[in-house]
Amino acid sequence: WELTILHTNDVHSRLEQTSEDSSKCVNASRCMGGVARLFTKVQQIRRAEPNVLLLDAGDQYQGTIWFTVYKGAEVAHFMNALRYDAMALGNHEFDNGVEGLIEPLLKEAKFPILSANIKAKGPLASQISGLYLPYKVLPVGDEVVGIVGYTSKETPFLSNPGTNLVFEDEITALQPEVDKLKTLNVNKIIALGHSGFEMDKLIAQKVRGVDVVVGGHSNTFLYTGNPPSKEVPAGKYPFIVTSDDGRKVPVVQAYAFGKYLGYLKIEFDERGNVISSHGNPILLNSSIPEDPSIKADINKWRIKLDNYSTQELGKTIVYLDGSSQSCRFRECNMGNLICDAMINNNLRHTDEMFWNHVSMCILNGGGIRSPIDERNNGTITWENLAAVLPFGGTFDLVQLKGSTLKKAFEHSVHRYGQSTGEFLQVGGIHVVYDLSRKPGDRVVKLDVLCTKCRVPSYDPLKMDEVYKVILPNFLANGGDGFQMIKDELLRHDSGDQDINVVSTYISKMKVIYPAVEGRIKFS
């Protein structure tokens, strides 16, 4: 019996087609992805093949103005239109709190939404009961397939699930649910979830009875043969893991942002064992037509976005200096504003010992592309912020050793004075440079704000300590020459859309007046 699994993950509100790098589509003839194009390909495959499941491994939420405006209603609407069969909860599905998940998505989705390792307690338990499930048994042709979900247990540090959801260890939570499916005579089981490729492989190895793992969170690109675009494969598709009980378990993921549609064909024997598996992600490039009816619907929903872009988010009573002349040479108040917003967006008081789990922010000055003039009645709009942060990036959470941070700050000024983008703006960090010293030895003082303290204060950076830092995904990926970050980071979790972070902060503060306050000094 053959099953075709079509899968997406980490779509991050890319409802419209995007450029090749998943930013805003500029030249339509070169654009990719989007739900209208995805629908065309899904329909084609459904038409051709008998037993097809369309699955999503989480993080539909967060990433473009679509989510900012529609807050998840767009996800439910267009996933319903594409007739998804199941979805796993990702960490970003909790970005607007549990209510922001329940109302727009859980109550509106016409497909099951799954996670076996999230347990509700207190008053939430009855409110959310039945709105998401640990597993679902789906009829496919003449057979049944069990889908069991899972979500990163780091979600409380990455999003806003509140205090009434407990995120358990994935493997511990999955095993009893898979066992239950086996007792229900379901012998074909897919684990669908959002914990990253390493955890996907562990689930394949450790959870008895799981036949296939469809994952997300780590934006992993797997491919067999010559890859069709810029993404470099982390391994073959599917990636085969030998389980502890000796089975060959295919593990798949389909990069991110709706650029590819994962396509996996599995052949099962009559006892539900995987006999063979093959496939590849399908690049959704512009040679695949956008479905006209879905496209028309997208255009209808778009109207509200255009109106939103020009509405006031808040006010500034000071000039927001985002000029290259400032942000690439010294501390600039636009850099301070953005870093303060980044920290504010990551406030998660999850432990009595810590006032917060993260206190530090770094931001490449070259990523700040425009100032905002306060003389326009102080008004700040989404449109203004899009000029400051035009690249459609995210502000991510990483874990780094102190020694890596020290290297990063040396790199920040290794060729100072040439208006290059690697000069770092900061939050929760005090740095002093001596430019008379040779490159690689210019950081004379580097103090960082404590987290394990009731009264935050600045202490000298410890080389061997592991620190959490918020930074642009551009830096996490080694951009602007920060190869040491990419090479030495110990953990990397994708965060929220950059403009969304700053706009939320400005809306919350209502009136802002960031200052230049001595975060960066030269001796």
């Epitope: 495959i45 038409r47 051709a48 396509y263 690049l283 512009s286 040679s287 037509p289 479905d291």
Partner: antibody, heavy 121, light 107 residues
Framework: QVQLVQSGAEVKKPGASVKVSCKAS????????LSWVRQATGQGLEWMGE????????YYNEKFKGRVTMTANTSISTAYMELSSLRSEDTAVYYC??????????????WGAGTTVTVSS | AIRMTQSPSSFSASTGDRVTITCKAS??????VAWYQQKPGKAPKLLIY???YRYSGVPSRFSGSGSGTDFTLTISCLQSEDFATYYC?????????FGGGTKLEIK
């Protein structure tokens, strides 16, 4: 290399049936769709229907529903098109053409050489 | 069924000429349009798929454009081997339909 080899010319009487074959080689037969297109002498092209050999799923042009049957034998990588209740206006060249539904070439990328079917009393 | 109206139905041109053939769909077909070349007694050959993508091995003088309902095939510098009949086809909805053809003849 990809090849679609069709069966030879047929002469049929009105009311009879004809079965045209299309043998595929050079690719995985079950991973592509096969369409049948006909062309009457001096006329344009007319799509009759398609079969997906991997699943056996068929889709027919309403115009031929009830008269056309498309099948595939995956063990010998051959597709068949049977047209019944033949009439003189069915006299045409019948082509099989491949369709890459997993790829991105929206069109028929390989065609058979055609089979001439003549319906005459 | 979606109607594909092709024009002109025939056209006389000389080698070296730039030739444009148009095709109009009776409803929005996105970019799901292909163009074929057919010579007498031969099967059609795919030239352009998805409205603007040149099929492998097709000379660069052939180009396609359009989306929605209006499509164009352009031959930038006509060669002697290009005299043939050209068909557009929509691949958006079944029944897949072809234009009536454009016969390109030597002037």
């Amino acid at each position: 290399q990809v090849q679609l080899v069709q069966s030879g010319a047929e002469v049929k009487k009105p009311g009879a049936s004809v079965k045209v074959s299309c043998k595929a080689s050079g690719y995985t037969f079950t991973s592509y769709g096969l369409s049948w297109v006909r062309q009457a002498t001096g006329q344009g092209l007319e799509w009759m229907g398609e079969i997906y050999p991997g699943s056996g799923n068929t889709y027919y042009n309403e115009k031929f529903k009830g008269r056309v049957t498309m099948t595939a034998n995956t063990s010998i990588s051959t597709a068949y098109m049977e047209l019944s209740s033949l009439r003189s206006e069915d006299t045409a060249v019948y082509y099989c053409a491949r369709y890459d539904y997993l790829g991105s070439s929206y069109g028929f990328d390989y065609w058979g050489a055609g089979t001439t079917v003549t319906v005459s009393s | 069924a979606i109607r594909m109206t092709q024009s002109p139905s025939s056209f006389s041109a000389s080698t070296g000429d730039r030739v444009t053939i148009t095709c109009k769909a009776s409803q929005d077909v996105s970019t799901a349009v292909a163009w074929y070349q057919q010579k007498p007694g031969k099967a059609p050959k795919l030239l352009i798929y998805s409205a603007s993508y040149r099929y492998s091995g097709v000379p660069s003088r052939f180009s396609g454009s359009g989306s929605g309902t209006d499509f164009t095939l352009t031959i930038s510098c006509l060669q002697s081997e290009d005299f043939a009949t050209y068909y557009c086809q929509q691949h958006y909805n079944t029944p897949y339909t072809f234009g009536g053809g454009t016969k390109l003849e030597i002037k």
